[in-house]
Every structure is written in C-alpha cells, then in structure tokens.
C-alpha cells in the first residue's frame, strides 16, 4: 500500500504570453498520494469550475483559457491540497499580447487657417503600439506646430495652407503594423474679424458705440447678438472698403449685456462665421435697475470650456457687479481646490461645479437658469466623491477647513429638481465619459467582494447606484 505523500508541484507555473482570441494554457503538474484537489485563482479570486471561459482538465492540473481577452491579464495560481501536509501553491503571470489595432481612426477634416486641427488615432495593442503619421508619401516630421500626442492623435497648431493634404496614421508594435485609411485635411480661409468690439463699463443710461471690422472673400456680412438674441434696440451703421466691412452699433445702456459681432460669408453651400464679443457693464449697478436676476450669454471663460456644451448659453447672476468675471473667479478658486481630490472624483466634481456655477440658460422675457438634476448631484456626492464628501462634512462639523472640497460652491442635492418631475427642466451631467484607465475602483464601497475586484464598470459588471461606507442625508 502506498504511503500518504504531501503534494509537490513538479512543474511550477511560468509566465505565459498569449494573443487576444487565442488559447492560453497553464500546466501545474502535482505529485502526491492520495490524489490532490487542485484549485485555480486569478488575481487571488477563485476560478469557478463551471465558468465556460475556462477548461480545467487532467484532474485540475491543466487550466486553459479558451479565448483570451484583453482583461485576462493577471497572476494565475494553482493550489494543490490532499489533506497530507499543507497546501502548496505555484503562480505565474498571463501577459496578453495584441497586434496593433486602430480603434478610432482619423477622419476628413476641414479647418480654417490659423486654427488648431486634431486628427484622432486611438490605438490598442500590447506591447503598446508607437504611432507615427504619413503625409502624402512621406513620413511626417514633428516641429513646433505639428506634434503627435500621447494618445496617438496628430495636433497641428496654427494650421497653414501648406498643411493641406492626405494623411494616415501608422500603429506599430513587435507583433505587426496597422495603417489607417487616407484622410484629407482641407484648409479654408473664411471670414475673419480684424477689429473686435471693445468692452465698456459705463453709467446707467449712457450711449455706447461698439465697432467691429471683418475681412473675407466674399465680403462678410456683420450681425450683432445681445445676450444670445438678436439686438432688440440700437442703431447699426455699416461701410465697406477693400473687402473690409466696418459695422458700428450704437446702444442706449439700461442693463449689462454681452454683445457679439458675427461676421458671415458663404463658401459654396456652406456659411462660415467669425465671432467677437464685448461686455457692457454698468458701474454701480443697483438692484432697482435690474429687470431680472441675471442674463443669458455664451460662456467665454477658460476654466469650464471643456466641460460645458459648446456654444451653449449659460446664466450670469447680476447680483455680482461683474457676473462673468466673478463667476469665473469662483470656479478658478474651486479648480485649484480640486487638485487635492482623487482622479475618480475630479472629473465628476468639475462637471458638477461648472454646471452649477454656469447653469444652462433659457433666454426669454426673464432669463431662466436650469439647475443640475438631483440624481446626478447625488451620484457625484455618494459615488464618485464619497471619500471627499465624508471628509468635507467631518471637517465642517469640527470647524476644520484645510484642504479638499470645503471651499467649493457645491449645490445642495436635496434642493435640486428631480428628473422624474420634468426631465427637460434640469441638466444632466456629462461626467460619465470616463476613459478606461481613469477608474480602477470606487472608494468607500461596502461589498462582500474584495475591492480589487471592483472594476471601472465596463461591460461585465454594473453600477446602478452605490453603497458608500457612510450615510448621506
């Protein structure tokens, strides 16, 4: 009769390299008596026997991943136990290799001379592919204007006529090369403003003349916009000389406003426009002179430029002497505070703050701001910024204000309108477009599963709300 023998792994696991959609096998040869029970883990999480993505054979000694996916990267371990002596373990890594793939190829671009052009070229692959660009038949050389970004996109500052042509991106790693289709960059010379109107700070009831000159072929027409609407009062005088149009708008000032000069000319079936704006503010703007609490205008600041919808009208609160500067200063201060928060919280908090300070605006007899939807506010507070909010509330209770989010002009979620009341009466936050690498785990989430297993919520898992490890009321 055989003597009992503790398990010994005679073939330790090794690092396995595998291409996406190929088969990967780990071998864990074990000698023991009686026959051991062999279990397998990935990143310390048990692989279930009935998981159809895996095949476990040879009494558990052979683990096969039937079709390797990008997300299968990790440390795989076999654990053998037969009740004699202790369990033994051997671990090895799976490195998923992938030929280059262009996931977001460049597209045809028409661009006005002098602007910035970005041709996207997002790639996948392991090892990470290097991206280069070809213009015409030649490799494109980078210079002070032309750069290939970390993402693979091609950025051309201050586009010139000679930048026009056919481009393609090339993604290359040790496993192969991928080419995008040829795309065309067209450089157009459209209407251009030579002299923008100047901002004025005047007394109530003053006359102001705003002047705007523009050039283009054909000669542009100039129109004026006041707080997002066609100018309702004032007189306009125009003159044209040598393809330059000069427009003068004379106004009688009874309220502050944002005045935009729009130069337009036609190219085939398309119109091109150039805009320049000036503010007319009123010195010692008293409450009696206000006909509403604010006005609608395009956001012209910098801090929230990437967060707010392009060309959207936002609400400026005239309880500030200079609403646009005051609100921009508030958000600028908030932005500096956000440097202290986690990468998970920051984009969500930025979206919340920008949309709270610069609320979408419906112009009309009384300009009306559109607050954030309550549910989005709650998701930012309880999901994305749970730790920060917990810390902030703790500091508030103890009278301590050092860092984090305490200075931020944050909304009170419970006072915001719900999407159920009227889905069109509140703003939904665009904080959801997270890049995969930006989220690894939600903080302070109470779950029976290990936090390392909480992913960035891609296809295989889900978040319909959150359970942070503290209570919000």
């Amino acid at each position: 009769e055989k003597l009992p023998k503790a398990p010994v792994i005679t073939t330790p696991l090794e690092t396995v390299d595998a291409l996406v959609e190929e088969v990967a096998t780990f071998m864990c040869a074990v000698e023991s008596y009686p026959q051991p029970e062999i279990s397998w883990t990935r990143n310390k999480i048990l692989i279930k026997l009935f998981d159809t993505r895996y095949s476990i054979r040879e009494n558990g000694q052979l683990l096969t991943i039937l079709s390797v996916e990008d997300s299968d990267d990790g440390i795989y371990c076999c654990i053998a136990n037969n009740g004699v002596g202790g369990a033994v373990e051997s671990c090895g890594a799976l490195q998923v290799k992938m030929k280059p793939k262009i996931t977001r190829p460049p597209i045809n671009v028409k661009i006005i001379e002098g602007l910035k052009a970005v041709l996207p070229c997002t790639t996948m692959g392991n090892p990470k592919p290097s991206v280069s660009w070809i213009k015409g038949d030649n490799a494109l050389r980078e210079n002070s204007r032309i750069a290939v970004l970390e993402s693979g996109s091609l950025r051309i500052h201050n586009v010139q006529k000679e930048d026009a042509g056919q481009y393609r991106c090339v993604a290359k790693n040790s496993l192969g090369t991928a080419y995008s289709k040829l795309v065309k960059l067209e450089v157009e010379v459209f209407a251009r403003i030579l002299r923008a109107p100047e901002s004025h700070n005047v007394t109530f009831g003053s006359f102001v003349t705003l002047r705007c000159t523009a050039i283009g072929i054909p000669v542009p027409t100039i129109s004026w916009i006041e707080n997002g609407n066609a100018v309702s009062s004032g007189s306009i005088q125009e003159s044209v000389k040598d393809r330059v149009i000069d427009s003068r708008l004379q106004l009688f000032i009874t309220k502050p406003g944002l005045y935009t000069c729009i130069a337009t000319n036609k190219h085939g079936e398309k119109f091109s426009t150039a805009k320049a704006a000036a503010t007319v503010s009123i010195a010692e703007w008293s409450k009696s002179q206000k006909d509403s609490q604010g006005y609608c205008a395009q956001y012209r600041g910098e801090v929230c430029d990437a967060v707010l919808a392009k060309d959207a009208l936002v609400f400026f609160n005239t309880s500030y002497r200079d609403p646009e500067d005051a609100q921009e200063l508030l958000i600028h201060t908030a932005w500096n505070e956000l440097k202290a928060v986690s990468p998970l919280c920051r984009p969500a908090a930025e979206a919340l703050l920008c949309n709270h300070l610069f609320q979408e605006c419906s112009p009309g007899v009384v300009p009306t701001p559109m607050p954030i939807c309550r549910e989005y506010c709650l998701a930012v507070k309880e999901l994305f910024c749970a730790k920060e909010w917990q810390a902030m509330e703790g500091k508030a209770h103890r009278g301590l204000y050092r860092s984090g989010m305490h200075l931020l002009p944050v909304p009170e979620c419970s006072k915001l309108p719900s999407m159920h009341r009227d889905p069109t009466a509140c703003t939904r936050l665009p904080y959801l477009d997270y890049k995969k690498e930006n989220i690894t785990t939600f903080p302070s989430i109470t779950s029976s599963r290990p936090s390392a297993d909480i992913p960035n919520l891609p296809a295989s898992t889900s978040s319909f709300a959150v359970s942070p490890a503290y209570s919000m009321t």
């Epitope: 309880e382 959801l432 599963r449 889900s462 319909f464």
Partner: antibody, heavy 124, light 107 residues
Amino acid sequence: EVQLVESGGGLVQPGGSLRLSCAASGFTVSSSSIHWVRQAPGKGLEWVASISSSYGSTSYADSVKGRFTISADTSKNTAYLQMNSLRAEDTAVYYCARSEGDRYVSGYMGMDYWGQGTLVTVSS
Amino acid sequence: DIQMTQSPSSLSASVGDRVTITCRASQSVSSAVAWYQQKPGKAPKLLIYSASSLYSGVPSRFSGSRSGTDFTLTISSLQPEDFATYYCQQSGVWLITFGQGTKVEIK
C-alpha cells in the same frame, strides 16, 4: 405612453432553456436601465439582472450568475433574458422594469415602469 | 451583500390609521432606496425614490425618510385602496436588493 411587454414565458423541464423578451415603447432602451425582477408564487420580489445598454454594463444576482444572460437590442428597443440550466426554484413570474438614466443615476430613480409579467414554470 | 430587513412582515390597520414600515440596511448605503406597492396579480408600482422623493401621481399621504441605515415608508392616513404589500429596494454597486415585503391588511 411608456409601455413594457414581456413574452417568452412557459413550461420548461429542469435543465432546459428559455428566452424572455421585453419590448419597450414610449422611451428608448439605450438611455435607460432595464431590470428583470421575479416573484415566485406567494413570495416576495427578487432582483435577477440589470443592463445599462448605453454602456453595455450588466449585473446579475448570485442565484442566476453563469446561467442567465441579459442583453438589449437598441435597434428593436427590446431587452432579453436568456435563461439556461433552469431549475425548479426559477419558477416565478418574471417582470421587466425600467429606471430612467444611465447606470450611475438609475438607482436613484427607482423602477418607474413595469411590464405585466410572464410566468416561467420549471417542472418535469 | 447588503440585506434589507423589512419590518413588520404584516400588519393590520384601519382606514385613517397612520402606518409606518421600516427597512434596515445591513450596512451603510446611499440614498438610492425606493419603495413599491404591489396588489395581488399586479406588477409593483413605484411610490418613493431616492429615499424620500414622492413619485409623480402618488398621493401625498405617502412619504419616505431615512435615518442612517434605517429607511421608513409612512402612510399618514390609510385609505381603502392602500391595502396591499409594500417592498423597499436598494441599489448598490454590485446588486439590487428588495426587502421581504410588508402586507398591510384590513383590521
């Protein structure tokens, strides 16, 4: 008017499969989260699975994980529940329900519209 | 996993009574808690969402509140049509959990 209509229920033997459909009208599946909730005869409500199709994110109750698959076809504005390896304890009325918004906010919205339910009986 | 313990499992009350149903979460949760009413042979109906918000079309005698991990549904003055089974439900990162239900019967 928002409506959810389930179909595909019926009698099936243990180990068998069924595919339930949930046809939505009056809203788009792509901008909502869809949930399957079941109720065994004389018992309470039990959540089965959810999908937020704008992100393709899905989640399942432990009792059905590995056996059931939730999916959505946004072109048909329909959600599905593929049920394999059915057991006697899966016998229930299966409801589909929606909650408004993406996967981050739908939990705050509650399941505001429900279908009439479809009966699944697992028996030999 | 988070459990929602609902109490009582059943209660008898008269028209005009004030009724309170409680759900206790087994650990701290967000305010993503909803309450539903279900009548025999019918699908559940949403009453309260986000712990305390009244769903449109639901009578104002229904209200929801929270205190830490305790969530409460209150019917301020019970009406004949309110006799039904009530469920709480919480939405978490990993799963959705329903309470076991409270049957409100006529005394």
